[in-house]
């Protein structure tokens, strides 16, 4: 005997209460994959979570972190307070980078500048503490016979003094 | 610190109105996030939600007791407060109140703190 | 409503031992799961967050693990304080539900 369930469309579940016709996901629940026996719950957004992507019936609803704050652990379980760019979040709170690292985003730790004369480059534009150092070409092809448009920038920032 | 601490009749009779009020400090329920659950225990069993209301006034209940309950808050005095109409025998429990949202820099949808609870005895 | 069940409902355990708790979701609730411990007479407390975060100022002799629908709490090394009812607690949707507790005594 043919499954009849596995005629029944996502977004619909497998009634076995009505000899087995495909009825519609109710209020609040989706079944993304067609031969469901049940609808699942969609996952609610509330408190310090916001709704990124409403539930359907086919779909799961998405949840995104209130303003100020950004997502963590799998599928945005838990919200982390964002800090400035140039910043990290310690235990203390938001704290500047030392000098030497830099951190481009809201999140995440500050990370030390990329060291140019590991690829036998030199450093075009400082770093600071929103981003990262820019490596130009090597100190050879900066030679007097070499044409460059304008000289290698100092390995450290003017008046920025460590933290 | 935060702190919450639950207040109300220890015994009320049977189809009498609860009022349970939730008092705490540490945290402001004007701050973005933040949100105060109430769940009870009867003696000897498991935990139950029953509501919850949030910074931005939404309020949630437990379907099954949705027509019973209602939640409210008092920002300035830094109050919660709880009723639940029509009591009956089955709701002898211990009431507690409860934090949600944000403590340091980081929040989700769990209970922490808790209050110390009271026991509430429906009895004729 | 997701329903959560806890298995075993009690459990009777040595100090020093190892001892596992698992919780089971009606469906998936990916990894919004706490852990909660309760003393007799006492308010529940936060142990474990997110299926496996540790509460700030909980032993590191506690651990969550799981996603899905299968979640497991462990205990290293059990602790005379250790003793205690342990509940399981879905954040997925409202109502948020309990698993309906597993209490942990001394053999």
């Known amino acids: 005997l043919q499954d009849l369930c596995s005629n029944c469309p996502a977004g619909t579940f497998c009634d076995n209460n009505r000899s087995q016709i495909c009825s519609p996901c109710p209020p609040n629940s989706f079944s993304s994959a067609g031969g469901q026996r049940t609808c699942d719950i969609c996952r609610q957004c509330k408190g310090v979570f916001k709704t990124r992507k409403e539930c359907s019936s086919t779909s799961n609803a998405e949840c995104d972190c209130i303003s100020g704050y950004h997502c963590l652990g799998a599928e945005c379980s838990m919200c982390e307070q964002d800090c400035k760019q140039g910043q990290e979040l310690t235990k203390k709170g938001c704290k500047d980078c030392c000098f030497g690292t830099f951190n481009d985003q809201k999140r995440g730790i500050c990370r030390p500048w990329t060291n140019c004369s590991l690829d036998g480059k030199s450093v075009l534009v400082n770093g600071t503490k929103e981003r990262d150092v820019v490596c130009g070409p090597s100190p050879a092809d900066l030679s007097p016979g070499a044409s460059s448009a304008t000289p290698p920038a100092p390995a450290r920032e003017p008046g920025h003094s460590p933290q | 610190q935060i702190t919450l601490k639950e207040s109300g009749p220890t015994l009320v009779k049977p189809t009498q109105t609860l009022t349970l009020t939730c008092t705490f400090s540490g945290f402001s329920l004007s701050t973005t996030g933040v949100g105060v659950n109430w769940i009870r225990q009867p003696p000897g069993e498991a935990l139950e939600w029953l509501a919850l209301?949030?910074?931005?006034?939404?309020?949630y209940y437990s379907p099954s007791l949705k027509s019973r309950l209602t939640i409210t808050k008092d920002t300035s005095k830094n109050q919660v407060v709880l009723t639940m109409t029509n009591m009956d025998p089955v709701d002898t429990a211990t009431y507690y109140c409860?934090?949600?949202?944000?403590?340091?820099?980081?929040?989700?949808?769990?209970?922490?703190?808790w209050g110390q609870g009271t026991l509430v005895t429906v009895s004729s | 409503d997701i329903q959560m069940t806890q298995s075993p409902s009690s459990l009777s355990a040595s100090v020093g031992d190892r001892v596992t708790i698992t919780c089971r979701a009606s469906?998936?609730?990916?990894?919004?799961l706490n852990w909660y411990q309760q003393k007799p007479g006492k308010a529940p407390k936060l142990l474990i967050y997110?299926?496996?975060s540790l509460q700030s100022g909980v032993p590191s002799r506690f651990s969550g693990s799981g996603s899905g629908t299968d979640f497991t709490l462990t205990i290293s090394s059990l602790q005379p304080e250790d003793f205690a009812t342990y509940y399981c607690?879905?954040?997925?949707?409202?109502?948020?539900?309990f698993g309906q507790g597993t209490k942990v005594e001394i053999k």
């Open positions: 469906q998936s609730i990916s990894s919004y």
């Open positions: 409860a934090h949600e949202g944000i403590i340091g820099f980081l929040g989700g949808n769990w209970f922490d703190p």
């Open positions: 997110a299926a496996s």
């Open positions: 209301i949030y910074w931005n006034d939404d309020t």
């Open positions: 607690q879905q954040s997925y949707s409202t109502p948020p539900t």
